[in-house]
């Protein structure tokens, strides 16, 4: 039960006080008691419940005709059952007794009022009155947790605007309102109550730039909403009529959780006594609601795809046809960014990561725009953000970034359990250097901080700086599976490729050619690849780098060897000993449910079939997956990327609600 104020009574004159329903009000009967009195008794109107405890040990008893010793160990508390119809209509009488004096009476006139700030603290999608049920001032995780949730209103419901909805002080329409969380102030007071009292709604100065609150005129159009709290306004006096009244507020978050903001916002209503114009307002009562800002959540390859994105560039029509066919098979929408908008930047995966935010009443896809800012710079903000599609970005928008700040270097695992700890939304994966040096690359700290601050997908740092491009999607992917953990981790594997090529040579296919059928590309015989000592050394190094990540992933995702599939792949070390795929990197695939778009490796053709394709199909088809090999050689591969790098996917949000987990 909420804490009320302390009321001091005195025999000299009647005391007038306000008691808010649902609060426990302390009654000080000792400090002004007549000197010679040693005991007291209390009588109260039927609407007042008086509790007297004498301790220690505390003996609690409701009032009757008993007398109680007048000593500091006696605690008297009041609660009120109903709101008053008129001011001071509930009475409490204290009678003081002494051995030689007649009883002395002190009178207390109480006004019972109902003041309650309600939000969806039970996370049902509905605001229910919660007075005296739960403490709204705490926010707790887990299925039995409580606490309201706010969405960053980061979409753009107004197509004529270039800004996010949370960047203005207006409510556009009912669509805009749905992105906000409802908070209701319920009051029940005597008619004349607010002639001597005021209610003020407020937020801590440290949080005022993270939230905006609109007051709605009940029953009217959303255009009647006016901003009452926000970056410029930490407090707002409310004009409340006496009697029974409900006031609706719509709350939007303006910022995602981050290093300097844990994501919690407390809104407080304060009841002030303004009866004495000569004196400052006195606080009579406060009620608070704590909101947590919904985190940005990534979706793994195991989530059903809903929309595929790719770029149209010079001569990639065949690539786009393949992606279109794949999207149709997977029943996905397809969005193509035209040449004039991508400015010859085809790396859709690197520009953005599509996740979502969720409150009990609303789920919203949100695009996280990377700071790489090349030709696709405007695409997320101009073409992806829109009605019910939010936007967020982090990191420096001009310079100061590395290749590791592109979002091919940002992936998320499917849900896992690691040594008994559940990650029901999976874990974020991004690449880093294995140790800092003058020229090592790392994901920008602002990006790392943002990802960690979301709390629900605890990030794992992998080692990717050994790669020329440096992205985790160059050596790993996840595919759905019908058994075990519901997925398999795919890892690029030079060892597996050498084994396959050695088997083919042993069977007399040493003359078979890699890159056969590719114009202007020097073909390589299996026997030459196997005998090239430098290439062996390069791949031995690469294998060590991938094995380091393999062990890291097994440990941090709780995986067994049987959860991992090795995809045959060779690399070569280029300038500054950075690795690049020797032939199209098959692990860099597009995963659309059971349909996989895999870079066509142009491996040695044996008995009419590419042995690399055949091997990969034999590994993945038993999982119910369908492999489509896409020719990306000249349009993507030789430009240091593949199918995954050149595409992006919006996926269905998890059915698991993030607030039900315990980070």
């Amino acid at each position: 039960m909420a804490q009320g104020t302390l009321i001091r009574v005195t025999p000299e004159q009647p005391t007038h006080a306000v008691c808010v329903l649902g609060t426990l009000t302390q009654l000080d009967i000792c400090s002004s008691a007549p000197e010679d009195c040693t005991s007291f008794s209390i009588n109260a109107s039927p609407g007042v419940v008086v509790d007297i405890a004498h301790g220690p040990p505390a003996k609690k008893k409701s009032t009757g005709s008993s007398t109680w010793p007048l000593d500091p160990g006696v605690e008297v508390t009041l609660t009120m059952k109903v709101a008053s119809g008129s001011t001071g209509d509930q009475k409490v009488q204290i009678s003081y007794y002494g051995p030689k004096t007649p009883p002395v009476k002190a009178l207390l006139y109480l006004t019972g009022v109902e003041i309650s700030l309600c939000a969806d603290i039970t996370r049902t999608g509905k605001v229910k009155p919660t007075r005296a049920v739960k403490d709204q001032r705490t926010w707790t995780w887990g299925p039995c947790g409580q606490g309201a949730i706010l969405l960053v209103n980061c979409d753009r419901d107004n197509l004529e605007s270039s800004a996010m909805d949370c960047e203005d002080d207006e409510v556009l329409d009912s669509e805009d309102l749905q992105d906000m969380s409802l908070m209701t102030l319920s009051t029940k007071t005597p008619k004349d109550f607010f002639t001597n009292h005021t209610l003020v709604l407020h937020v801590a100065r440290s949080e005022m730039d993270k939230v905006r609150v609109f007051q709605a005129t009940r029953g009217k159009l959303s255009s009647k909403c006016s901003v009452v709290l926000g970056p410029k306004w930490p407090s707002h006096y409310l004009m409340v009529p006496g009697g029974k009244h409900n006031m609706d507020f719509y709350v939007e978050a303006l910022a995602f959780p981050d290093t300097d903001f844990p994501g919690l916002i407390t809104l407080t209503i304060s009841l002030l006594d303004t009866s004495n114009l000569e004196l400052p307002e006195a606080v009579v009562f406060q009620d608070s609601v704590v909101f947590r800002v919904a985190p940005w959540i990534m979706t793994p390859n195991t989530q059903p795809p809903q929309e595929v994105y790719a770029c149209s560039i010079f001569e990639n029509e065949d690539f786009l046809k393949s992606v279109t066919t794949l999207a149709m098979k997977a029943k996905c929408k397809l969005t193509i960014c035209p040449e004039e908008e991508n400015m010859d930047d085809q790396w859709m995966q690197d520009e953005m990561e599509i996740g979502y935010i969720q409150a009990p009443h609303k789920t919203l896809p949100v695009v996280f725009d990377s700071p790489r800012n090349r030709g696709l710079k405007e695409f997320p903000i101009k073409r992806v953000m829109g009605p019910d599609f939010g936007y967020v970005t982090r990191g420096p928008q001009t310079g100061g970034i590395s290749g590791l700040d592109s979002f091919g270097n940002l992936e998320v695992s499917p849900p896992v359990t690691v040594r008994g700890k559940e990650y029901p939304l999976g874990r974020i994966l991004f690449g880093d250097s294995c140790y800092p040096s003058n020229d090592s690359r790392q994901m920008h700290q602002a990006l790392q901080d943002f990802l960690s601050a979301q709390q629900v997908q605890a990030p794992v740092k992998l080692y990717s700086d050994w790669l020329s491009v440096g992205h985790v999607d160059e050596f790993l992917s996840f595919v759905p599976a019908p058994d075990r953990k519901g997925f398999r981790l795919l890892l690029a594997s030079p060892r597996s490729c050498y084994k396959l090529f050695q088997e083919q040579q042993n069977e007399g296919h040493g003359e078979a050619l890699l890159f056969e059928g590719i114009k202007k590309k020097k073909q390589q015989k299996i026997k030459n690849i196997l005998s090239n000592k430098t290439l062996r050394e390069h791949n031995s190094f690469v294998e060590r780098c991938i094995d380091w990540n393999r062990e890291l992933l097994k440990r941090e995702l709780g995986l067994a060897e049987s959860d991992i599939i090795d995809i045959p792949q060779l690399f070569k070390l280029k300038e500054f000993s950075k690795a690049e795929a020797f032939f199209p990197n098959m692990v860099n695939m597009l995963v659309l449910g059971k349909h996989l778009g895999i870079p066509k490796p142009f491996g040695p053709v044996i008995n009419g079939r590419c042995c690399l394709e055949e091997k990969v199909c034999s590994l993945l088809e038993p999982l119910g997956l369908q492999c489509t090999f896409i020719n990306d050689f000249f349009t993507y591969h030789i430009r240091h990327g593949e199918v995954h790098c050149g595409t992006n996917v919006r996926r269905k949000p998890f059915s698991f609600k993030w607030w039900n987990m315990v980070p």
Partner: antibody, heavy 128, light 111 residues
Framework: QVQLVESGGGLVKPGGSLRLSCAAS????????VSWIRQAPGKGLEWVSF????????YYADSVRGRFTISRDNAKNSVYLQMNSLRAEDTAVYYC?????????????????????WGRGTLVTVSS | QSALTQPRSVSGSPGQSVTISCTGT?????????VSWYQQHPGKAPKLIIY???ERPSGVPDRFSGSKSGNTASLTISGLQAEDEADYYC???????????FGGGTKLTVL
């Protein structure tokens, strides 16, 4: 073959900044590694910085690290050298140079470590 | 002071051969095959004449040859001609924190 032209040099006070540009013609610069090399008046060559074709990693000489930033815009067929906190000892002719990536070798022969195409240079003078 | 050591000057008569040495360490010349040589005439940009220790770009006469032994690389110019008079610089990839090093340059005079 690609031709390179440097620009952006000039006189600047110590502590000042300059941005050098290297524009390519005759070929697509995105196929090339690019380095900046400088030569102080009457002195030898000094390697300054490198950027790979994919624009994913960069390297710097100890003498300029933290002050200079190399970048590229493949759409504009250009590479840039942003020079901040300039010192008198940065006075030099700055050359832009490139090497084509030989995609046909089984193992790359390290073309990023040498420069087979050079621009004519742009003079940077740091003096108060 | 340059990281790779070259003689300040060498000279030779037309038709003769000259060799310019370039001495590094086991962390650069001795470790990698990424040694290259450049020719620079006064007031001009340098020109690549040898890469990967001994390979010649197309258009470079076969009078220019390169080799390496231990931590020392060498450029040999046979059948000297007047137009060979120039400054010559060696370069190598390095394990050090500056990954490409140059020699201090050698002035070749054709007598």
């Amino acid at each position: 073959q690609v031709q390179l032209v440097e620009s952006g040099g000039g006189l600047v006070k110590p502590g000042g900044s300059l941005r050098l540009s290297c524009a390519a013609s005759g070929s697509t610069l995105s196929d090339y590694f690019v380095s900046w090399i400088r030569q102080a008046p009457g002195k030898g060559l000094e390697w300054v910085s490198f950027i790979n074709q994919a624009n994913t990693f960069t390297y710097y000489a100890d003498s300029v690290r933290g002050r200079f930033t190399i970048s590229r815009d493949n759409a504009k067929n250009s590479v840039y050298l942003q020079m901040n906190s300039l010192r008198a000892e940065d006075t030099a002719v700055y050359y832009c140079s490139s090497a084509n990536d030989d995609v046909d070798d089984i193992v790359a022969p390290g073309r990023g470590y040498y420069m087979d195409v050079w621009g004519r240079g742009t003079l940077v003078t740091v003096s108060s | 002071q340059s990281a790779l050591t070259q003689p300040r000057s060498v000279s030779g008569s037309p038709g003769q051969s000259v060799t310019i040495s370039c001495t590094g360490t086991s962390g650069d010349v001795g470790r990698y095959s990424h040694v290259s040589w450049y020719q620079q005439h006064p007031g001009k940009a340098p020109k690549l004449i040898i890469y990967n220790v001994y390979e010649r770009p197309s258009g470079v006469p076969d009078r220019f040859s390169g080799s390496k032994s231990g931590n020392t690389a060498s450029l040999t110019i046979s059948g000297l001609q007047a137009e060979d008079e120039a400054d010559y610089y060696c370069s190598s990839h390095s394990r050090s924190s500056t990954p490409v090093l140059f020699g201090g340059g050698t002035k070749l005079t054709v007598l």
